[in-house]
C-alpha cells in the first residue's frame, strides 16, 4: 500500500481548509456538507459539541456557547491588549487563568473552560476527519499554517493544538509562504520573479513579498494587519442596516444578540453576492419584535461603507515594499489570496496602486494557503513528484530576535524577515567588575527598548571567573529551526561553560502534562461526539423511515392494493413513532433503533406484500428487505433436481 499522505491545513481565523498532495496534484477536500472551507467554529450545547458548519449554523440560537476567533487568542496572554480589545466583541466569555485566556462555556449542563489551543485542536480534529473521510485511512502528519505576524508563542501554541488533535505537526509555515508555494508550482523555471502576495481573509491581512527562482522561494518581507478582514466588512454592513432599521421602524436592534447575529449572517451573504452582482437583497423574516426586514444594498454603497478599510490595505503593501527595498515597478506578479480579495474594489485599488498591472487570480483565493501547505507536507514526507521535488522553501522570521543589553537596550541578533532556518552568533561581555554571571533575556520585536518588545524567555549563565568589566567573552548564539522555534545558547569562552534555552514560552504556554491531558480530553470528546453522531443518525433513520412509510401507504397509487386494516395499522404505528420522536428528540441510540425495528416489524411485511410479484423491489428508501431465513439468514435460492 502507498504510504499515508500528509495533509496541509490552513487554520484560519474564520474558516479553515485542508488539502492533500497525491497523484501529482493537490486536492482541496470538501467537508460532509460539500464545502471546501469549514468554519473555524466550535459550539457547545446541552447535548453535544458541534464543529464547523453545524456550529456556525446554530450560532444565532446559542451565541454564548459558540466559540470562534480562537486564533485571535492562541498563544496570547490574557492581559494582551489585543485580547482585551477583542473580548468586547465576542458573545462568549473569556476568563483569566494565570494570565492565560480561557473560553468559558456551558456544555451538557456544566460550566467548562477551554484553552484556545483546545478550541483550535477541535477545529484541527475536524479538518483531520475531513481528510480521513476522503482518503479512507487515518492521517497523522500535517503542515499547519499561521499568519506571518504570529510570534513564537503563537506558533508554539498552534503546534500544541495540532498535538492535542492527534497530529504530528511536520512544520508550522506562514500563510503567505504557503500561498507562494501554491503559486510557484505553476510558475517554476521562469527566471527570478518578485511576487507580492496580498492575503485578505476573514480575520487577518498579510502582505508578503517573495522572490521565486527556479522553484526556490525566499520571503523578502512581510507586513499586514492582524485585525483586518472580511468580518470587518460584515460589521460595516451590520451597522449600516442597524441604522436603517432604526430609521424605518424606530427600533434599535443592536442590543438583541440573536437579531444582530441573524442580520450578520444575511450581511455576509450579501457581501459575497456583491462581488459578482451590483446589488444584493436581504430578506429576514421576523428580525425583531415580529418585524420582517426586507431591504437591499448596492455595490457602490458597500464600497462607500468600507472605503477607509479598503484603502488601508495599501499601507502594509507600501511597508512591505520598503522592507524588501523594492520599488513597485520591480514586482512581477501580484497574487490574490483570501476570500475578501474577490471584492472588486479591493482588486481595483491594488491594481491602480501598481499602475494597472494585471492581478493573478488563477488560484482560488480561499484555497491557496491549504494548497501550498499540502505541497509542503508532501515535500517534508519525501514526495518524489517532479512537481515538488525541486521546490525549496525559505521562510522568514516575522520579528527581530535579540537580547537585552545594558540600559534595557534591544540588541537584535536576527533581524526580522531574515530567511530561516538561521543561526547568528555575537560576543557580549560583562557590565560590572567581577560579575559572576549574566542574565540572558530574549526578546522579539522592532522597538529600540526591550520594555516595548515581547519577552520570550530568560536564563542565567553563572560561574564566570572574576574579571574586570569588559574582559569576559560571552558568546551568544541564536538558532532558529525551520519551524521558527528558537534556541539560544550562551558560552563563557574562558571556561567553556554554557547554558541554553529553547524558547517555548513556558510562561505563556501549556505544559507537557496539560497538553497530554488535553490530548486525552480530545479523545474523550471525540468518543462523545461519535456517540452523538450515532444517536443522531439513528434518530434520522427512524424519522425518515416513519415518514417514508406514512407517505407510501397514503400514496393514491396504492388504492385498492392495500387493505384499510393494513393501512390503518401502518399509519397508527407511524403516528405513534412520529409523535414519540417529537417528544423524545434526546432519546438514546438504542431507543431510536428499537422504535425503528418495531416500526419495520409492522410495516415491512405489509409493504413487501404490495411489491411481491410486481417485478421489482419496494419503493426506494424503505429498507423493506424480505424475511431472512436460517439462523437469521436462510436459503435465497433453491437447487432444482
Amino acid at each position: 500500500m502507498a504510504k499515508a499522505a500528509a495533509i496541509g491545513i490552513d487554520l484560519g481565523t474564520t474558516y479553515s481548509c485542508v488539502g492533500v498532495f497525491q497523484h501529482g496534484k493537490v486536492e482541496i477536500i470538501a467537508n460532509d456538507q460539500g464545502n471546501r472551507t469549514t468554519p473555524s467554529y466550535v459550539a457547545f450545547t446541552d447535548t453535544e459539541r458541534l464543529i464547523g458548519d453545524a456550529a456556525k449554523n446554530q450560532v444565532a440560537l446559542n451565541p454564548q456557547n459558540t466559540v470562534f476567533d480562537a486564533k485571535r487568542l492562541i498563544g496570547r496572554k490574557f492581559g494582551d491588549p489585543v485580547v482585551q480589545s477583542d473580548m468586547k466583541h465576542w458573545p462568549f466569555q473569556v476568563i483569566n487563568d494565570g494570565d492565560k485566556p480561557k473560553v468559558q462555556v456551558s456544555y451538557k449542563g456544566e460550566t467548562k473552560a477551554f484553552y484556545p489551543e483546545e478550541i483550535s485542536s477541535m477545529v484541527l480534529t475536524k479538518m483531520k476527519e475531513i481528510a480521513e473521510a476522503y482518503l479512507g485511512y487515518p492521517v497523522t502528519n500535517a503542515v499547519i499554517t499561521v499568519p506571518a505576524y504570529f510570534n513564537d508563542s503563537q506558533r508554539q501554541a498552534t503546534k500544541d493544538a495540532g498535538v492535542i488533535a492527534g497530529l504530528n505537526v511536520l512544520r508550522i509555515i506562514n500563510e503567505p509562504t504557503a500561498a507562494a508555494i501554491a503559486y510557484g508550482l505553476d510558475r517554476t523555471g521562469k527566471g527570478e520573479r518578485n511576487v507580492l502576495i496580498f492575503d485578505l481573509g476573514g480575520g487577518t491581512f498579510d502582505v508578503s513579498i517573495l522572490t521565486i527562482d527556479d522553484g526556490i522561494f525566499e520571503v523578502k518581507a512581510t507586513a499586514g494587519d492582524t485585525h483586518l478582514g472580511g468580518e470587518d466588512f460584515d460589521n460595516r454592513l451590520v451597522n449600516h442596516f442597524v441604522e436603517e432599521f432604526k430609521r424605518k421602524h424606530k427600533k434599535d436592534i443592536s442590543q438583541n444578540k440573536r437579531a444582530v447575529r441573524r442580520l450578520r449572517t444575511a450581511c455576509e451573504r450579501a457581501k459575497r453576492t456583491l462581488s459578482s452582482s451590483t446589488q444584493a437583497s436581504l430578506e429576514i423574516d421576523s428580525l425583531f419584535e415580529g418585524i420582517d426586514f426586507y431591504t437591499s444594498i448596492t455595490r457602490a454603497r458597500f464600497e462607500e461603507l468600507c472605503s477607509d478599510l479598503f484603502r488601508s490595505t495599501l499601507e502594509p503593501v507600501e511597508k512591505a515594499l520598503r522592507d524588501a527595498k523594492l520599488d513597485k515597478a520591480q514586482i512581477h506578479d501580484l497574487v490574490l489570496v483570501g476570500g475578501s480579495t474577490r471584492i472588486p474594489k479591493v482588486q481595483k485599488l491594488l491594481q491602480d496602486f501598481f499602475n494597472g498591472r494585471d492581478l493573478n487570480k488563477s488560484i482560488n483565493p480561499d484555497e491557496a494557503v491549504a494548497y501550498g501547505a499540502a505541497v509542503q507536507a508532501a515535500i517534508l514526507m519525501g514526495d518524489k513528484s517532479e512537481n515538488v521535488q525541486d521546490l525549496l522553501l525559505l521562510d522568514v522570521a516575522p520579528l527581530s530576535l535579540g537580547l537585552e543589553t545594558a540600559g534595557g537596550v534591544m540588541t537584535a541578533l536576527i533581524k526580522r524577515n531574515s530567511t530561516i532556518p538561521t543561526k547568528q552568533t555575537q560576543i557580549f561581555t560583562t557590565y560590572s567588575d567581577n560579575q559572576p554571571g549574566v542574565l540572558i533575556q530574549v526578546y522579539e520585536g522592532e522597538r529600540a527598548m526591550t520594555k516595548d518588545n515581547n519577552l520570550l524567555g530568560r536564563f542565567e549563565l553563572s560561574g564566570i571567573p572574576p574579571a574586570p568589566r569588559g574582559v569576559p567573552q560571552i558568546e551568544v548564539t541564536f538558532d532558529i529551526d525551520a519551524n521558527g522555534i528558537l534556541n539560544v545558547t550562551a558560552t563563557d569562552k574562558s571556561t567553556g561553560k554554557a547554558n541554553k534555552i529553547t524558547i517555548t514560552n513556558d510562561k505563556g504556554r501549556l505544559s507537557k502534562e496539560e497538553i497530554e491531558r488535553m490530548v486525552q480530553e480530545a479523545e474523550k470528546y471525540k468518543a462523545e461526539d461519535e456517540v452523538q453522531r450515532e444517536r443522531v443518525s439513528a434518530k434520522n433513520a427512524l424519522e425518515s423511515y416513519a415518514f417514508n412509510m406514512k407517505s407510501a401507504v397514503e400514496d393514491e397509487g396504492l388504492k385498492g392494493k392495500i387493505s384499510e386494516a393494513d393501512k390503518k395499522k401502518v399509519l397508527d404505528k407511524c403516528q405513534e413513532v412520529i409523535s414519540w420522536l417529537d417528544a423524545n428528540t434526546l432519546a438514546e441510540k438504542d431507543e431510536f433503533e428499537h422504535k425503528r425495528k418495531e416500526l419495520e416489524q409492522v410495516c415491512n411485511p405489509i409493504i413487501s406484500g404490495l411489491y411481491q410479484g410486481a417485478g421489482g423491489p419496494g419503493p426506494g428508501g424503505f429498507g423493506a428487505q424480505g424475511p431472512k431465513g436460517g439462523s437469521g439468514s436462510g436459503p435465497t435460492i433453491e437447487e432444482v433436481d
Epitope: 397508527d572 403516528q575 405513534e576 412520529i578 409523535s579 414519540w580 417529537d582 417528544a583 423524545n584 432519546a587 438504542d590 431507543e591 433503533e593 428499537h594 422504535k595 425495528k597 418495531e598 419495520e600 416489524q601 415491512n604 411485511p605 428487505q625 424475511p627 431472512k628 437469521g632 439468514s633
Partner: antibody, heavy 116, light 112 residues
Framework: QIQLVQSGVEVKKPGASVKVSCKAS????????MNWVRQAPGQGLEWMGW????????TYADDFKGRFTFTTDTSTSTAYMEVRSLRSDDTAVYFC?????????WGQGTLVTVSS | EIVLTQSPDSLAVSLGERATINCKSS????????????LAWYQQKAGQSPKLLIY???TRESGVPDRFSGSGSGTDFTLSIDSLQAEDVAVYYC????????FGGGTKVEIK
C-alpha cells in the same frame, strides 16, 4: 390456534452455552416480533430484548448485551435464544413472547439451571 | 431507562371485594399523537406463563373478563379487579412500551 412451544429443561455447567428454541405456529411468523423474558427463581419478569423476525435485527436490554444472542429460522418459524459463558445467576425460566400491541402470546417457558 | 414501581408488593382481598394495584412510572408514558399511554398489565399464575390482560392502559385483551379494568395517564396507573374471584390469585405485572420495554416488580394478590 396461535401457539409458542419452547424446548425443554436444560441443566448446564458454568462456562457452557445453552440455546433455547421457540417454535411458532398459527400465524405468519415474520409479521410479529419475538421477545424474550427471563424470570429468576422467586423473582419478577425481566425483559431481555427482542428480534425483528422480518429483518433479523435485534435489540437487547442493557443487562443482556454481550453473552446473549437472538436468532430466527424463518423456514421453520422458530426463534432461538442463546446464552454463552453461563453463570449461576443465569439460572431462570426463559420465556419467548410474540409482540403485537403487547406481548399477547407466550411460550410455556424453559427452565435453564446452571450448576457445577 | 424507564423504571416502573408497583405498589403494594402484595395484597390480600376478600372474595368479591375490589383489588387495586398501582404502577408508577419514572417518566410519562403518554403519546400525544396517538393519545395513548403505553402501559400494559399481565397476570401470572403460579407455575404458568404470564398472560396479557390489558394494553394501552385500558384496552382489555380479548377473552379477559370485564371485572379487570385499567386506568391512569402520564406516570400513574391502576389495575382494578372489581369482584375478586378465586382464579384471580396471581402475581400482576405492569409493563411499559413507551420506549424499549420494562416490567414493574410485580404485586402478589391473595385471598383474605
Amino acid at each position: 390456534q396461535i401457539q409458542l412451544v419452547q424446548s425443554g429443561v436444560e441443566v448446564k455447567k458454568p462456562g457452557a452455552s445453552v440455546k433455547v428454541s421457540c417454535k411458532a405456529s398459527g400465524y405468519t411468523f415474520t409479521n410479529y416480533g419475538m421477545n424474550w423474558v427471563r424470570q429468576a427463581p422467586g423473582q419478577g419478569l425481566e425483559w431481555m430484548g427482542w428480534i425483528n423476525t422480518y429483518t433479523g435485527e435485534t435489540t437487547y436490554a442493557d443487562d443482556f448485551k454481550g453473552r446473549f444472542t437472538f436468532t430466527t429460522d424463518t423456514s421453520t418459524s422458530t426463534a432461538y435464544m442463546e446464552v454463552r459463558s453461563l453463570r449461576s445467576d443465569d439460572t431462570a425460566v426463559y420465556f419467548c413472547a410474540r409482540y403485537d400491541h403487547a406481548m399477547d402470546y407466550w411460550g410455556q417457558g424453559t427452565l435453564v439451571t446452571v450448576s457445577s | 431507562e424507564i423504571v416502573l414501581t408497583q405498589s403494594p408488593d402484595s395484597l390480600a382481598v376478600s372474595l368479591g371485594e375490589r383489588a387495586t394495584i398501582n404502577c408508577k412510572s419514572s417518566q410519562s408514558l403518554f403519546n400525544s399523537g396517538t393519545r395513548k399511554n403505553y402501559l400494559a398489565w399481565y397476570q401470572q399464575k403460579a407455575g404458568q406463563s404470564p398472560k396479557l390482560l390489558i394494553y394501552w392502559t385500558s384496552t382489555r385483551e380479548s377473552g379477559v373478563p370485564d371485572r379487570f379494568s385499567g386506568s391512569g395517564s402520564g406516570t400513574d396507573f391502576t389495575l382494578s379487579i372489581d369482584s375478586l374471584q378465586a382464579e384471580d390469585v396471581a402475581v400482576y405485572y405492569c409493563k411499559q412500551s413507551y420506549t424499549l420495554y420494562t416490567f414493574g416488580g410485580g404485586t402478589k394478590v391473595e385471598i383474605k
